[in-house]
Interface confidence: low
């Protein structure tokens, strides 16, 4: 693209099925030109997205794109839910689409929870 605007390449309706107890890296692909933006992760709770300030994050730089990574070490059952990354630069702020984690408890690793089960467990 000719535009030098920041882009957040999280696919709409993307999802990850992961196991509790495993390490996991949730990536926010970030495209920028000159100055790297300030990026944060938040977790959706109803209509609000709660900023994850006390979680380990890191940057991974690649040739054409960078990744702002939220680390889960290890994944916990209550990590179930939807996450969003946001970028702040100059006076602008953009938000990614949400990405959903479906966490399967190791006790029942053979069964992936349904979306309804996951939702009721998450919002309970």
């Amino acid at each position: 693209k000719e535009s030098c605007d920041v882009q957040l390449y999280i696919k709409r309706q993307s999802e990850h099925s992961i196991l509790a107890g495993d390490p996991f890296e949730l990536e926010c692909p970030v495209k920028y030109c000159a100055n790297r933006p300030h990026v944060t992760w938040c977790k959706l709770n109803g209509t609000t997205c709660v900023k994850l300030e006390d979680r380990q994050t890191s940057w991974k730089e690649e040739k054409n794109i960078s990744f702002f990574i939220l680390h889960f070490e290890p994944v916990l059952p209550n990590d179930n839910g939807s996450y969003r990354c946001s970028a702040n630069f100059q006076s602008n702020r953009i938000e990614s689409h949400s990405t959903t984690l479906y966490v399967t408890d190791v006790k029942s690793a053979s069964e992936r929870p349904s979306k309804d089960e996951m939702a009721s467990r998450f919002w309970a």
Epitope: D5, Q7, L8, Y9, K11, R12, I65, N92, S96
Partner: antibody, heavy 118, light 111 residues
Amino acid sequence: EVQLQESGPSLVKPSQTLSLTCSVTGDSITSAYWNWIRKFPGNKLEYMGYISYSGSTYFNPSLKSRISITRNTSKNQYYLQLNSVTTEDTATYYCARSHYYGYYFDYWGHGTTLTVSS
Amino acid sequence: DIVLTQSPASLAVSLGQRATISCRASETIDSYGDSLMHWYQQKAGQPPKLLIYRASNLESGIPARFSGSGSRTDFTLTINPVEADDVATYYCQQTDEDPYTFGGGTKLEIK
């Protein structure tokens, strides 16, 4: 709900400048991308360009010497200006929003029909 | 520019049957491992309406009779079963590369 509405003249003389307005409700033009597309009488669709949430612009190279896209964030409007129009610019002009990821056009205006004729 | 060639230019399908529209790109559509190819429906006197985004994702509110498939240079829109309300012109669009381009359109009629 996001709504876009084009406004402007329906008839312009050759060599004059076309000015169109797209008024946006239900979303801020300081988010996403805001595009202009036109459809010619033969049904061909042509992408003209965009103004982004930050105010940066992109123009189709086929129009680059004649086109400008600007905005007024306080009015939540963006504008198309096309200079030196000819009869070849006769078309229906649409404004549309596209998303950060994928750039597909999820909301469109109803379109405004322009005839270039002396 | 990426040229999108749609075929057929028009087709007539019986109610309840399947309609298949093809879109072939002059270059690979594969930005960041994703196919930025989209499909729109345009009825007479109306603006285009998004049906499928990123090759195979159904836009919210669009009936599941519509589906998209394909990758790289060959993409397909399928309507199954066709209903009377589907009479329209269908366009593919790529947003993989500037300038964005549209296919020439496929006019769907009922037999």
